[in-house]
Structures are given as structure tokens and as C-alpha cells.
């Protein structure tokens, strides 16, 4: 039977080395055996290149194309072939379809003043345009309570987030994951990073104190209160 594309290719670029296109065929297809995606930069002297697609699902194909460090002017001509039959033809501008790389190495460290310090790595080298353009979303969720989750938007430069332990349930196990996007490129969100898990062992301040400590604290409080009035 004839080969047909049900959903035409949708492509995204990580804006550094790879563009990925995905499409759906109208019936289960052995993508690597039956199809080829040719791509060529619209640029003087550029050669035609061929990508061999892989199956993501029975009828969904995906092709990863190595590209040079992308620049805004780059436009690729894409042609999807089944043998000698041209199934689809289109163009793709990586700078207009950015999906950032996934942030890496998410770690959680205890920090001063009952806070957790979440750190991750910017997935781009400093010389890449996207390095300074990324903002992040951090999702923190209670492993045993689906209702207990928080989302933090990190819009400043550093790939870190300080989290007050008091905002989380004491003794509960929490997981965090992070994703990135590039606002100036109107990008989509990156994939989520792998989760990292930790135990929130924070206890409210008064629970850490013995009776004597509480008594001393009350004495200090009384003394300060009395001293304050004495000056009036």
C-alpha cells in the first residue's frame, strides 16, 4: 500500500549540536528501513545530508540530526522520503524552534539557617548564546503525598535554589527535578532532569529545645521586654 504521513514532522533544536524531528505515519512503520529524512542548510555550498529515523512508537518516527552551532539565520530544507517517493517537504529554522538541553547534575545540600541548597548545571558552555538566556523551573514533591508539591521559577542567572526546610513537611521524603527554557528564543521547555531525593529532617525551632533552653529563652525575652520599657 501507499505510505502516508499522518502528522507532519515537528522539529526542535538544542541550538548547539542537534535538531530532532518527530512525525507520525498513518500505520505502523519500520522507520529505519522504510524512511529517510534529508536535510540541507540553505547556504552557499551546503551539501545534502541524510538522517535515518528510528521508531519511538509503532507509527511514530524520530530523527536526530547533527547540526553545527546554530545561528539565527540558519534555515534547513527538509525532505521526507520513502524510497523514491517524496512524502513531505518543508523548511526548519532552528532559532525559531528551540528546545533547550536538559539541566544536569541536580544535587541537594543542607545549608545554613535550616535551608536546603539545590544546585544543577547549566547544560550550555559559556560561549553558547543560550548559556546566559536560560531560566529554570524546579518542581519539588513529597514522595508520599501527591498533593504536597511546589513549583519554583528561577529567573536569576545562577543555577541554584535555596529552599527553607520549614516549607516542607518534617520527616518526609522529597524529590526535586529541574527543567529549562530560553525566554528570548521563545523556546519550549526542556525535558525534566532526573529526580534527586532527600529526607527533610527539619523540626520546628521549639521542638529542638529542652525545658531549660525554653526557660532561658523566656528569661531573655522577659529581660528584653523589661529593658525596653525601662527606657521609656
Amino acid at each position: 500500500g501507499s505510505v502516508k504521513v499522518l502528522h507532519e514532522p515537528s522539529c526542535f533544536s538544542d541550538y548547539i549540536s542537534t535538531s530532532v524531528c518527530q512525525w507520525k505515519m498513518d500505520h505502523p512503520t519500520n522507520c529505519s528501513a522504510e524512511l529517510r529524512l534529508s536535510y540541507q542548510l540553505d547556504f552557499m555550498g551546503s551539501e545534502n545530508h541524510t538522517c535515518v529515523p528510528e521508531n519511538r512508537e509503532d507509527s511514530v518516527c524520530v530523527c536526530s540530526m547533527p547540526i553545527d552551532d546554530a545561528v539565527e539565520a540558519d534555515v534547513y530544507q527538509l525532505d521526507l522520503w520513502a524510497g523514491q517517493q517524496l512524502l513531505w517537504s518543508g523548511s526548519f529554522q532552528p532559532s525559531k524552534h528551540v528546545k533547550p538541553r536538559t539541566p544536569g547534575n541536580l544535587t541537594v545540600h543542607p545549608n545554613i539557617s535550616h535551608t536546603w541548597l539545590l544546585m544543577w548545571t547549566n547544560p550550555y558552555p559559556t560561549e553558547n548564546h543560550l548559556h546566559s538566556e536560560l531560566t529554570y523551573m524546579v518542581n519539588v514533591s513529597n514522595d508520599n503525598d501527591p498533593e504536597d508539591f511546589k513549583v519554583y521559577n528561577v529567573t536569576y542567572m545562577g543555577p541554584t535554589l535555596r529552599l527553607a526546610a520549614s516549607t516542607l513537611k518534617s520527616g518526609a521524603s522529597y524529590s526535586a527535578r529541574v527543567r529549562a527554557w530560553a525566554q528570548t528564543y521563545n523556546s519550549t521547555w526542556s525535558d525534566w532532569s532526573p529526580s534527586t531525593t532527600w529526607l527533610n529532617y527539619y523540626e520546628p525551632w521549639e521542638q529542638h529545645l529542652g525545658l531549660n533552653d525554653i526557660f532561658e529563652a523566656q528569661k531573655i525575652e522577659w529581660h528584653e521586654h523589661h529593658h525596653h520599657h525601662h527606657h521609656h
Epitope: L41, F43, M44, G45, S46, E47, N48, H49, V71
Partner: antibody, heavy 125, light 112 residues
Framework: EVQLVESGGDLVKPGGSLRLSCVAS????????MTWVRQAPGKGLQWVST????????YYADAVKGRFTISRDNAKNTLYLQMNSLRAEDTAVYYC??????????????????WGQGTLVTVSS | DIVMTQTPLSLSVSPGETASISCRAS???????????LDWYLQKPGQSPQGLIY???KRASGVPDRFSGSGSGTDFTLRISRVEANDTGVYYC?????????FGQGTKLEIK
């Protein structure tokens, strides 16, 4: 040492044909686009044609489109320019030159970095 | 097509002085930051052209640092400092952003 040697230039009558050759040495020929540029007597430089490293992409000046064909034999490290339906205004010295590196996705450009010595084509009755 | 206009068409300079040649393109030659597809070539009398500057400001291999290229977009300049007798010839700018490649008319440099 990178070197280009052109040959094939001659005196030919209008409407005639000629094939120019350019033999390359000293670099990986197949990795680079190659270009022909010509210079009419006492005039400036004029681009004629360019071919990508694999030979898969060709480009022509409007003045020669449909009459000239650029090709290459990467096994022989040789660039060709087949010139048909020649006219008096095609009279010029023809130079071949090394153009951009085309084995990368976006070709890397270093200018027309090396030029041949040129071969003279004269079209006259 | 992109039209390249060179000025002046001829130039006479004393040895040791600085020569400047301008080249204007009818369209921007900037493809991406730092990548202006504009070259400068020198053709000495009776010789083949030789590359001096590519991508607007990068010196070709073996070219002395007396030769420098500057500019971006549509306006470019070739400067030759401490001019020598050996610098005589015709200087051409050329755009290589897209086909057809186009050359300026050429500037004839004469050493006094």
C-alpha cells in the same frame, strides 16, 4: 603545498565548445567547494561557477547558465568547466580557486584561498 | 544580485603611508555575529589574484599584518599601513554570502 593547475584554454570559434580542467594537489580535494572565476582582457574579475565538495550542488552566473557545466572527479582531484555555445564575450583568462570547506553542515569559509595560474580562452572567428 | 561598489578606483600613495579602500554592498553581508562574507583580493601585474582578507577582517595565511580589514553589514574598508612598492596592483572586494558571487570594480594602487 596546495596547488591548482588549469589547462584546456584555446582559440575557438563562436558557437564552439571547450573543456577546461583544473588539477588540484596538496589538500583533500573532495572536502572543498571549487570555483571558476574569469577575467576579460583589461577588465575586472567575474565569478563564473561554483561546485560543492561532493559535486551535488552547482551554481552558475546568469551569463553562462545553460551553456557552461561545472563538474568534478574527486578520484582524479580534477575540476572541469565544460563550455558550450561559446560567444565572443566569453573571451577571458579562466581561473580555478579553492572555495569553502563543505564537509561540515555549514560550510566553513576561508575566502578563495588558492588560485590557479589561469588559462586563456579566446572566442573569435 | 548583490552589487559591490569600490572607492576610489585608483589611488597613489607614497611608501610608508597608509592606503584605504572602501567597499559598499547593496545588501548586508552579515550572516551571523562576526561572519561578514566579504573578501579582499590583490592582483599584482601579470599574476593571478591572491587572497588577503576573508570574512571581513580575517587575514589569509601568509598575509602581513600591514593589511587589515574592517566593517560590518554593508560598509567595509581595507587598510594597508606602511605601504611598500610590492603592494602595487589592483585590489578587489568580493561578496561570498550568496550566489552569484560579485566583485567590486577594482582599485588600482600605485606607489609614488
Amino acid at each position: 603545498e596546495v596547488q591548482l593547475v588549469e589547462s584546456g584554454g584555446d582559440l575557438v570559434k563562436p558557437g564552439g565548445s571547450l573543456r577546461l580542467s583544473c588539477v588540484a594537489s596538496g589538500f583533500t580535494f573532495r572536502d572543498y567547494a571549487m570555483t571558476w572565476v574569469r577575467q576579460a582582457p583589461g577588465k575586472g574579475l567575474q565569478w563564473v561557477s561554483t561546485i560543492s565538495g561532493s559535486g551535488g550542488k552547482t551554481y552558475y552566473a546568469d551569463a553562462v547558465k545553460g551553456r557552461f557545466t561545472i563538474s568534478r572527479d574527486n578520484a582524479k582531484n580534477t575540476l572541469y568547466l565544460q563550455m558550450n555555445s561559446l560567444r565572443a564575450e566569453d573571451t577571458a583568462v579562466y581561473y580555478c580557486a579553492v572555495d569553502r570547506l563543505t564537509k561540515t553542515i555549514r560550510p566553513q569559509y576561508y575566502g578563495l584561498s588558492v588560485w590557479g595560474q589561469g588559462t586563456l580562452v579566446t572566442v573569435s572567428s | 544580485d548583490i552589487v559591490m561598489t569600490q572607492t576610489p578606483l585608483s589611488l597613489s600613495v607614497s611608501p610608508g603611508e597608509t592606503a584605504s579602500i572602501s567597499c559598499r554592498a547593496s545588501q548586508s553581508l552579515l550572516y551571523s555575529i562576526g561572519y561578514n562574507y566579504l573578501d579582499w583580493y590583490l592582483q599584482k601585474p601579470g599574476q593571478s589574484p591572491q587572497g588577503l582578507i576573508y570574512l571581513g577582517s580575517k587575514r589569509a595565511s601568509g598575509v602581513p599584518d600591514r593589511f587589515s580589514g574592517s566593517g560590518s553589514g554593508t560598509d567595509f574598508t581595507l587598510r594597508i599601513s606602511r605601504v611598500e612598492a610590492n603592494d602595487t596592483g589592483v585590489y578587489y572586494c568580493m561578496q561570498a554570502l550568496r550566489d552569484p558571487y560579485t566583485f567590486g570594480q577594482g582599485t588600482k594602487l600605485e606607489i609614488k
